[in-house]
């Protein structure tokens, strides 16, 4: 297993609709053919997998149909979007990148992006 540097923003604020986007960039010494990207959430010393996608370079990322993640790639940059976030989902979201093919296997783990989610205030009742 070879180590690889992964960069991601330190902080992102989710939109009022519970959507957060960030770029995960990996520094590889060459072009992989098959890449796996996993988003992990760390909160209260617990780490859980949020979503994962394996893609062929030059093709779109394909997450599972029921995934809360979507993404696109350009070169070594992966643009990740996480949807359906609520205040309780605030936490550190870590980008993990694996170069699956060709060998040898490279692994890189980012320092994490702290995503802050603020639930919108409910609309006040209206007489109209």
């Amino acid at each position: 297993c070879k180590a690889m540097h992964v960069a991601q923003p330190a902080v992102v604020l989710a939109s009022s609709r519970g959507i957060a986007s960030f770029v995960c960039e990996y520094a590889s010494p060459g072009k992989a053919t098959e890449v796996r990207v996993t988003v992990l959430r760390q909160a209260d010393s617990q780490v859980t997998e949020v979503c994962a996608a394996t893609y062929m370079m030059g093709n779109e990322l394909t997450f599972l149909d029921d995934s809360i993640c979507t993404g696109t790639s350009s070169g070594n940059q992966v643009n990740l979007t996480i949807q359906g976030l609520r205040a309780m989902d605030t936490g550190l979201y870590i980008c993990k990148v694996e170069l699956m093919y060709p060998p040898p296997y490279y692994l890189g783990i980012g320092n994490g992006t702290q995503i802050y989610v603020i639930d919108p205030e409910p609309c006040p009742d209206s007489d109209f």
């Epitope: 010494p29 070594n76 060709p102 040898p104």
Partner: antibody, heavy 120, light 107 residues
């Protein structure tokens, strides 16, 4: 540590074939990476010639496609080879072998190079 | 093929000083660039890959930057052992192509 070492004749006659060997120590060429030949002309210009992958697939520089062949030793997987046919004086250069990750990449290990002169 | 236009072809600098070498690609190479140091009688030595990532064992005096078509290598606190020829190489597309080289001399 990984080491690469080129070897072959230092003098080749025009119209003949040039054959070079790259011996690899510290890594089996079937375990990964792409294994390249690069040459440096007398004016210092570097030219990528081609490579062979860990699983034996080739890519060549289009400028050499009709004259070049890169193969590997299939018994111990510790050597790969360059054959360049119909050489001319323009093929006089220092020839390097090197490896890179992925279908295209930056070369992290190089041999020290071997000088080849094409002359009658 | 992607052309890599490297400049200057040579430069002279003082010990302890700083130099910058540039490479311009004929198209966007999406940060897929490596930089090498080459000394006579040896193979080139990889300094930096993916624009700015230092190869293990390379001192932090070396740094790289750029995006799109424009890239640069900087060396600060120049030392006598930095005397060499430096090359850029793109790895966005085959065939792999190199810059023409920059010969660094110390004043």
């Amino acid at each position: 540590d990984v080491q690469l070492q080129e070897s072959g004749p230092g003098l080749v006659k025009p119209s003949q074939s040039l054959s070079l060997t790259c011996s690899v120590t510290g890594y089996s060429i079937t375990s990964g990476f792409y294994w390249n030949w690069i040459r440096q002309f007398p004016g210092n210009k570097l030219e990528w010639m081609g490579h062979i992958s860990h699983d034996g697939r080739n890519n060549y520089n289009p400028s050499l496609i009709n004259r070049i062949s890169i193969t590997r030793d299939t018994s111990k997987f510790l050597q790969f080879f360059l054959k360049l046919s119909s050489v001319t004086t323009e093929d006089t250069a220092t020839y390097f072998c090197a490896r890179h990750y992925g279908s295209s990449g930056a070369m992290d290990y190089w041999g020290q190079g071997t000088s080849v002169t094409v002359s009658s | 093929d992607i052309q890599m236009t490297q400049s200057p072809s040579s430069l002279s600098a003082s010990l302890g000083g700083k130099v910058t070498i540039t490479c311009k690609a004929s198209q966007d190479i999406k940060k897929y660039i490596g930089w090498y140091q080459h000394k006579p009688g040896k193979g080139p030595r990889l300094l930096i890959y993916y624009t700015s990532t230092l190869q293990p064992g390379i001192p932090s005096r070396f740094s790289g930057s750029g995006s799109g078509r424009d890239y640069s290598l900087s060396i600060r606190n120049l030392e006598p052992e930095d005397i060499a020829t430096y090359y850029c190489q793109q790895y966005d597309n085959l065939p792999l192509t190199f810059g023409s080289g920059t010969k660094l001399e110390i004043k």
